[in-house]
């Protein structure tokens, strides 16, 4: 039945701070949900590459009502770094859920979105246990880089002011030997 | 915000039909399960069957096989639930319950009806 | 599969109550419980879901646990009120069906 095909919702939950500080490890878990039928592909993205190493999936998506036999589905995987990995705020991690849906053709008249074959994402950036976040992180790159203008800045003014001062102290020797 | 309004009060006779309506409303209809609970005065909550708005398909719990059907009309909102051969027994407050999904580990209701008395007398 | 839960529980006001919820088969590891309050003439109200979590605006009062050894589900409700006071019912579900406990009457003194 065509009207019943929903796309996934995926979410990223972020590792636990007690798991952190007991393992030395971090995992984050990925969890598509609502989904029918259960053509689904999930992968995990770090840094723009897709990552296979520390990943377990669910072997199959699992009725979310299991009394149903049109119910719609759930799959959730796990994807476990070293907990400096996953607090450097540079790192960035991406569960994508390509879902197979309905086709272009495929006709559709229900009052919501057509449900077509997509890749549907969720994202997490690495956070350091001393409050740091991507957006901090990224502050203070900023801010770093400002400071670092103004002082090649300031340095610039002050060479081209010594430079002047010596070119004019050279040209008034000149002017006084001859 | 999400609401489920029932229909009103019915007084049937043994051996006769009812049918009890859950209008859904602030949601997606298609997107949210609906149970269907029932509660005998005096007594706990027992659970009758579910229904998938958007397939259709539904499931009952074994003591009301055969004589449950549960219906949804995806145009109004609304799903149905219809008790025949109905006995003295079966006097009781019926309750829709919707519950959106989302895990495969919970199965709940999220929202309740306000509840249909149903009375059976001769 | 069955829900067992005690008839009834008593408790001052202030006090601390549990309600314990016996599964007879499965486990609330995978099939997880969900707790409804139910006051004299009402709906019934989610307080827990998927064993431990409030619903948004259920106060912090009430909170579920788990315990696997005895595969049984609680209730605690702590700084009792007399608006506690209510049905309580846990319920589960399996392959084929959904299930609720009898339920159990907190009386606060």
């Known amino acids: 039945d065509l009207k019943n095909v929903f796309p996934p919702k995926v979410a990223v939950f972020e590792p636990s701070e007690a798991e952190i500080s007991h393992t030395q490890k971090a995992t984050l878990v990925c969890l598509a949900t609502g989904f029918y039928p259960d053509h689904v592909e999930l992968s995990w993205w770090v840094n723009g590459k897709e990552v296979h190493s520390g990943v377990s999936t669910d072997p199959q998506p699992l009725k979310e009502q299991p009394a149903l036999n049109d119910s719609r589905y759930c799959l959730s995987s796990r994807l476990r770094v070293s907990a400096t990995f996953w607090q450097n705020p540079r790192n960035h991690f991406r569960c994508q859920v390509q879902f197979y849906g309905l086709s272009e053709n495929d006709e559709w008249t229900q009052d919501r979105a057509k449900p077509v074959t997509q890749i549907v994402s969720a994202e997490a950036w690495g956070r350091a246990d001393c409050g740091f976040t991507s957006e901090s992180y990224q502050q203070g790159v900023l801010s770093a880089t400002i400071l670092y203008e103004i002082l090649l800045g300031k340095a610039t003014l002050y060479a081209v002011l010594v430079s002047a001062l010596v070119l004019m102290a050279m040209v008034k020797r000149k002017d006084s030997r001859g | 915000q999400m609401q489920l309004v029932q229909s009103g009060a019915e007084v049937k006779k043994p051996g006769a039909s009812v049918k009890v309506s859950c209008k859904a409303s602030?949601?997606?209809?298609?997107?949210?399960?609906m149970h269907w609970v029932r509660q005998a005065p005096g007594q706990g909550l027992e659970w009758m069957g579910i229904i998938n708005p958007s397939g259709g398909s539904t499931s009952y719990a074994q003591k009301f096989q055969g004589r449950v059907t549960m219906t949804r009309d995806t145009s109004t909102s609304t799903v149905y639930m219809e008790l025949s051969r109905l006995r003295s027994d079966d006097t009781a407050v019926y309750y829709c319950?919707?519950?959106?999904?989302?895990?495969?580990?919970?199965?709940?209701?999220?929202?309740w009806g306000q509840g249909t008395t149903v009375t059976v007398s001769s | 599969f069955m829900l067992t839960q005690p008839q009834s529980v008593s408790e001052s006001p202030g006090k601390t109550v549990t309600i314990s919820c016996t599964r007879s088969?499965?486990?609330?590891?995978?099939?997880?419980v969900q707790w409804y309050q139910q006051r004299p003439g009402s709906s019934p109200t989610t307080v827990i879901y998927?064993?431990?979590?409030?619903p948004s605006g259920v106060p912090d009062r009430f909170s579920g646990s788990i315990d696997s050894s005895s595969n049984s589900a609680t209730l605690t409700i702590s700084g009792l009120k007399t608006e506690d006071e209510a049905d309580y019912y846990c319920?589960?579900?399996?392959?084929?069906?959904?299930?609720f406990g009898g339920g159990t009457q907190l009386t606060v003194l």
């Open positions: 319920q589960s579900y399996d392959e084929v069906s959904v299930v």
């Open positions: 319950a919707s519950n959106r999904g989302g895990s495969y580990k919970s199965v709940g209701m999220d929202v």
């Open positions: 088969s499965g486990n609330f590891a995978s099939k997880y």
């Open positions: 998927e064993n431990y979590q409030r």
């Open positions: 602030g949601y997606t209809f298609a997107s949210y399960y």
